[in-house]
C-alpha cells in the first residue's frame, strides 16, 4: 500500500515522498527511487519564501514611484521586496500597494499620533484648556495661555480653536501703595 502522508519537508508524488526544495529554490524535477529532487536557485528579482515544490519563482514586488512607493527592504531569493511610502504619505493597505497623503488635523483637533509609512495621522479633539488654530499633520493641541502667570487677566475666553486673550489687571481692583 503506497504512503498517504510524508514528513514536513517532503511531498507525496508518484506514491513516494520527495524532498521539498529549500526557500530560494524552485523545483526542476521530482525525485525517483534512485535520484533526489532537483532544485534550482531563483533568478535575479525572484523569490520563494518557503520549502516548496513550485516550478516557478515569484517576482519581487515592484515599488512604483508613481504610486508614491519606495523600497524599504530589497528582496532576496528567499524574501519579497518590502515597499513603503514616500515622506508625508502612508500605505492604503497592509500589502502597501499604494499610498495616500497623511491626513491633517483640522482646527479644534490636535495630533494624537503622528503618521508613519504604514499608518495615518490620528487626531483628537482638543479638550477644555487646549486649542489648535491650524490644520496640521504634526501640531498637537496647545494649552491655553495662563494669564495669571503673566500677571494678566483673561479678557476673552479660549475655545478649542482659539487661545485665551489676556489683558491688563483692572486698575480699580489693584491697590498701589505710594510712598
Amino acid at each position: 500500500e503506497p504512503p498517504t502522508a510524508c514528513r514536513e519537508k517532503q511531498y507525496l508524488i508518484n506514491s513516494q515522498c520527495c524532498s521539498l526544495c529549500q526557500p530560494g529554490q524552485k523545483l526542476v524535477s521530482d525525485c525517483t527511487e534512485f535520484t533526489e529532487t532537483e532544485c534550482l536557485p531563483c533568478g535575479e528579482s525572484e523569490f520563494l519564501d518557503t520549502w516548496n515544490r513550485e516550478t516557478h519563482c515569484h517576482q519581487h514586488k515592484y515599488c512604483d514611484p508613481n504610486l508614491g512607493l519606495r523600497v524599504q527592504q530589497k528582496g532576496t531569493s528567499e524574501t519579497d521586496t518590502i515597499c513603503t511610502c514616500e515622506e508625508g504619505w502612508h500605505c492604503t493597505s497592509e500589502a502597501c500597494e499604494s499610498c495616500v497623503l497623511h491626513r491633517s488635523c483640522s482646527p479644534g483637533f490636535g495630533v494624537k499620533q503622528i503618521a508613519t509609512g504604514v499608518s495615518d495621522t490620528i487626531c483628537e479633539p482638543c479638550p477644555v484648556g487646549f486649542f489648535s488654530n491650524v490644520s496640521s499633520a504634526f501640531e498637537k493641541c496647545h494649552p491655553w495661555t495662563s494669564c495669571e502667570t503673566k500677571d494678566l487677566v483673561v479678557q476673552q475666553a479660549g475655545t478649542n480653536k482659539t487661545d485665551v486673550v489676556c489683558g491688563p489687571q483692572d486698575r480699580l481692583r489693584h491697590h498701589h501703595h505710594h510712598h
Epitope: Q16, E36, T37, E38
Partner: antibody, heavy 127, light 107 residues
Framework: EVQLLESGGGLVRPGGSLRLSCAAS????????MNWVRQAPGKGLEWVSY????????DYADSVKGRFTVSRDNSKNLLYLQMNSLRAEDTAVYYC????????????????????WGQGTMVTVSS | DIQLTQSPSSLTASVGDRVTITCRSS??????LAWYQQKPGKPPKLLIY???SLEVGVPSRFSGSGSGTDFTLTISSLQPEDFATYYC?????????FGQGTKLEIK
C-alpha cells in the same frame, strides 16, 4: 539539557487501554515532528507512529492502525499515544523520539533522523 | 512497505578491527537512511543520517555510505565501547522501517 521522558506504561489485560505520555524539556516540542518506536523484549526496533509538528498529519504502522492514536499538546510540550484493544504482541518498551531535519544550505537536499530518544516505558499486555 | 535487511545478524570482532555492516532496501530510498547504535537497557543513539552524514559528537571512526538500495556502516577501528547492536532505518516514506539489527560482540 534536551530530554524526552515517557510515562504511563504498566500491566494491562488483553483488550484493555493505556495512554502513554512523553514530556519534552530543553527544547520546544511544537517545532518538531515526533515518533513513537517500540521494542519487544529481546527483539528489534519497530516504528509505531508519527505526528507532524502541528499535529495535523499522523501515520501508523499497519500493526497498530485503527487501535492506536497519536496526539500532542504543544502548549504543554507533551506527546501522547492512546492505545486501545491491546494485544499480547503489543508488549514492549515504548520510546518517543524526536524527528530532526538536518539541512546544510550548501547541499541540495536535507535528511531526517531521530536524534533524541526517551528512556522508554514498559507496556505489558497479559492476562 | 519498504523492507530493510541487515547483514550479518551478528558478528564477533576484536578491538582494532575494521567492521562493515550492510543494509539492503527492498526498493530505492535514495539516501534517506539512518544508522543507530543501541546498548542493552538503553535507547538507540543516532550515528549517521542521510546515509553518510555523521551526527555531531559521534567519533569519526564511524562512517556511512551508499544510496538507492545498498548501504554500509563502517567502523574503522573497533573500540571497546562500540560493542552493541546496530540498526538501519529508512525515513524515505511511511511506514518508516528498521532493519532487524546487527549484534556486534567481542571476540
Amino acid at each position: 539539557e534536551v530530554q524526552l521522558l515517557e510515562s504511563g506504561g504498566g500491566l494491562v489485560r488483553p483488550g484493555g487501554s493505556l495512554r502513554l505520555s512523553c514530556a519534552a524539556s530543553g527544547f520546544t516540542a511544537g517545532s518538531y515532528e515526533m515518533n513513537w518506536v517500540r521494542q519487544a523484549p529481546g527483539k528489534g526496533l519497530e516504528w509505531v507512529s508519527y505526528i507532524s509538528s502541528s499535529g495535523e498529519t499522523t501515520d501508523y504502522a499497519d500493526s497498530v492502525k485503527g487501535r492506536f492514536t497519536v496526539s500532542r499538546d504543544n502548549s504543554k510540550n507533551l506527546l501522547y499515544l492512546q492505545m486501545n484493544s491491546l494485544r499480547a504482541e503489543d508488549t514492549a518498551v515504548y520510546y518517543c523520539a524526536r524527528d530532526v531535519f538536518f539541512f546544510d544550505s550548501s547541499g541540495d537536499n536535507g535528511a531526517y533522523g531521530m536524534d533524541v530518544w526517551g528512556q522508554g516505558t514498559m507496556v505489558t499486555v497479559s492476562s | 512497505d519498504i523492507q530493510l535487511t541487515q547483514s550479518p545478524s551478528s558478528l564477533t570482532a576484536s578491538v582494532g578491527d575494521r567492521v562493515t555492516i550492510t543494509c539492503r532496501s527492498s526498493q530505492g530510498i535514495r539516501s534517506s537512511l539512518a544508522w543507530y547504535q543501541q546498548k542493552p537497557g538503553k535507547p538507540p543513539k543516532l550515528l549517521i543520517y542521510g546515509a553518510s552524514s555523521l551526527e555531531v559528537g559521534v567519533p569519526s571512526r564511524f562512517s556511512g555510505s551508499g544510496s538507492g538500495t545498498d548501504f554500509t556502516l563502517t567502523i574503522s577501528s573497533l573500540q571497546p565501547e562500540d560493542f552493541a547492536t546496530y540498526y538501519c532505518q529508512q525515513l524515505n516514506s511511511f511506514p518508516s522501517t528498521f532493519g532487524q539489527g546487527t549484534k556486534l560482540e567481542i571476540k
